[in-house]
């Protein structure tokens, strides 16, 4: 027989199947061109001295063989004596160590047996009821396929899975979705219902992120508030990168995790926009306001868990920057203007109360007045800062109030509301003898002292009721006691105390009468 033909004679070895565990298996035959065909198989066991024979039986019952030698692949033409248009049965017999080993048989029509293409082009990935759904367009003119997938994680080997039979212009596969690790998938196809048909090559890798994007493990730090009333938010620790399977390393579209920074400005609730979402790489400048910051991780399946932080307000105060004048019509604040056409947000809240009770007012865009000052006025009827208590005031400014990251802090200070001069009057003034010509005057702290920076000083006034002479003694705002000396025994005096702010003189306390008793010597 010629080597290119299927030999219709008995093969050159005895016909006996050893039934051993080793031997030829996984025979695949398919058409490789208009007139050529190929069969390939695997051989399990020691290969030394093994001779392979491809056996073929026609539907007529006649059988022939090709001698392949030690090769496990053999090509033949449609003129080799094998009927390609009709069903044939093929198997491999391997002659080794004086015994014959036989592969399982495959029965097929060679003419129609073509090797399919793997899924080509765009493979769409989505999540369906906790599983992964892959979908792709069936390669043209190859409808009717059996599809398999294989998948691996960074730490596990390939695992094989079945997609089942497909018979449409689009094919799809349901695959397992890992919760916390990325996966690499590959798909392959073969003719449906054709025994012994050959699998296509594996498709290009499909890289799939975990169902849950990794929780961002990042840390922030906030710089000091600068002269411009802004402070930089900086990232101390980058988010950890997702570990990828081998075929997804480098460029792995599909597994990307995007981290976004969500800023929520808690201060100044009357502004138009309270939240802004930014890319994590672009770290913003913030005002001195209080913020909540969240880092949100998301992948193609949506957002994951987020990590949140609270950035407290910068409480550094500048007591001299704000001027407040109280008139009959109402109250006006003045402060150094930032620039032309600025919108200001004035926020106030009673000291010692929850931050949620802050009130604020937004000004229309304003230019500085001739003295370079910006102003905000309110009437008594408005009730703003009307109660006689300490308020914490912060003023923010922005040329673009709709942009959350462009606000800056102008100043933070304290203000005592209502009728501060009356409310601040010291009470419980008491006089105690100190020596033969002096007394100690004590009083309860003024309500103004609860308001840092508001109380400028106490003034103690002593009046000689005989001569009508008056002396005034300034006292540090931290003190609530003063010694009056140079007094004369037997003379009646009255003492009063007032509390002054930088812009307001206080109201005198009720006069307190006293005298130093004349000492009678024995």
């Amino acid at each position: 027989c010629r080597t290119s033909e299927c030999c219709f004679q008995d093969p050159p070895y005895p016909d006996a199947d050893s039934g051993s565990a080793s031997g030829p298996r996984d025979l695949r035959c398919y058409r490789i061109s208009s007139d050529r065909y190929e069969c390939s198989w695997q051989y399990e066991g020691p290969t030394a001295g093994v001779s392979h024979f491809l056996r073929c039986c026609l539907s007529s019952g006649r059988c022939c063989y090709f001698a392949a030698g030690s090769a496990t692949r053999l090509q033949f033409s449609d003129q080799a004596g094998v009927s390609v248009l009709y069903t044939v049965t093929l198997w491999v017999e391997s002659w080794a160590r004086n015994q014959t080993e036989k592969s399982p048989e495959v029965t097929l029509q060679l003419y129609n047996s073509v090797k399919y293409e793997p899924p080509l082009g765009d493979i769409k990935v989505s999540k369906l009821a906790g599983q992964l759904r892959m979908e792709w367009e069936t390669p043209d003119n190859q409808v009717g396929a059996e599809v398999q997938f294989r998948h691996r994680t960074p730490s596990s080997p390939w695992k094989l899975g079945d997609c089942g039979p497909q018979d449409d212009d689009t094919e799809s596969c349901l695959c397992p979705l890992e919760m916390n690790v990325a996966q690499e998938f590959q798909l392959r196809r073969r003719q449906l219902g054709s025994q012994g048909s050959s699998w296509s090559k594996w498709s290009s890798p499909v890289c799939v992120p975990p169902e849950n994007p990794p929780q961002p493990q990042v840390r922030f730090s906030v710089e000091q508030l600068g002269q411009d009333g802004r402070r930089r938010l900086t990232l101390k620790e980058q988010p950890t990168q997702l570990e990828l399977p081998e075929g997804c390393q480098g460029l792995a579209p599909g597994t990307e995790v995007t981290y976004r920074l969500q800023l929520h400005m808690l201060s100044c609730p009357c502004k138009a926009k309270a939240t802004r979402t930014l890319h994590l790489g672009k770290m913003p400048y913030l005002s001195g306001a209080a913020y909540n910051v969240a880092v949100i991780s998301s992948n193609q399946f949506g957002p994951g868990l987020n990590q949140t932080w609270h950035i407290p307000a910068d409480t550094h105060t500048e007591p001299v920057a704000l001027n407040i004048s109280v008139g009959t019509n109402g109250t006006t604040m003045y402060w150094p203007a930032r620039a032309q056409s600025m919108t200001y947000c004035i926020e106030w809240q009673p000291v010692g109360q929850d931050g949620g009770l802050a009130t604020c007012s937004l000004t229309a865009p304003q230019d500085p007045d001739p003295a370079g000052m910006a102003t905000y006025s309110w009437s008594r009827e408005s009730g703003a800062m009307g109660q006689e208590k300490c308020y914490y005031i912060t003023i923010f400014a922005s040329a673009h109030p709709e942009k959350l990251t462009l606000w800056s802090t102008v100043l933070s200070t304290y203000h005592f509301g209502g009728n501060a001069s009356a409310a601040g009057t010291p009470h419980h003034v008491s006089v105690k003898n100190h020596s033969l010509d002096s007394v100690s005057v004590d009083w309860a702290p003024s309500l103004l002292s609860t308001c840092p920076g508001v109380l400028k000083e106490y003034v103690v006034r002593c009046r000689d009721e005989d001569s009508k002479q008056v002396s005034e003694h300034p006292v540090q705002p931290t003190e609530t006691q003063v010694t009056l000396s140079g007094l004369r025994a037997g003379v009646a005096y009255t003492v009063q105390v007032r509390a002054d702010t930088a812009w307001l003189r206080g109201v005198w306390s009720q006069p307190q009468r006293f005298s130093i008793e004349v000492q009678v010597s024995d």
């Epitope: 129609n112 003119n141 409808v143 212009d169 219902g193």
Partner: nanobody, 127 residues
Framework: EVQLVESGGGLVQTGGSLRLSCAAS????????MGWFRQTPGKEREFVGE??????????ADSVKGRFTISRANAKNTITMYLQMSSLKSEDTAVYYC??????????????????WGQGTQVTVSS
């Protein structure tokens, strides 16, 4: 559903050449193969040749081998199959039909393997 329309038939001298076209439209992605058959009055349809679409593998009847060539071109949702005929003989005179199948089994020369057929185009070879 697939529609097939042939064109290009006509009168040609012995030894001459002619190119037939068959335009397939509709769900052409489901097709496995397209073929040419011919029929003369009072006779069965005779297989001429076939092309496996996904691989461009061709197969011809012995009577036309070496003289006829089948090819195809793809456009969006349309496949055009061609039959280039050269060295024409008077016995090539017939109505030429285009056929298409969407199953992977069966003998290419059997008419019952094909689900879709064109209306035919006349080829006359005169001496």
């Amino acid at each position: 559903e697939v529609q097939l329309v042939e064109s290009g038939g006509g009168l040609v001298q012995t030894g001459g050449s002619l190119r037939l076209s068959c335009a397939a439209s509709g769900r052409t992605s489901r097709l496995v193969a397209m073929g040419w058959f011919r029929q003369t009055p009072g006779k069965e349809r005779e297989f001429v040749g076939e092309i496996i679409l996904s691989k461009d593998f061709t197969y011809y009847a012995d009577s036309v081998k070496g003289r006829f060539t089948i090819s195809r071109a793809n456009a969006k949702n349309t496949i055009t199959m061609y039959l280039q005929m050269s060295s024409l003989k008077s016995e090539d005179t017939a109505v030429y039909y285009c056929a298409a199948r969407q199953n992977w089994s069966g003998h290419p020369a059997r008419t019952n393997e094909y689900e879709y057929w064109g209306q035919g185009t006349q080829v006359t070879v005169s001496s």
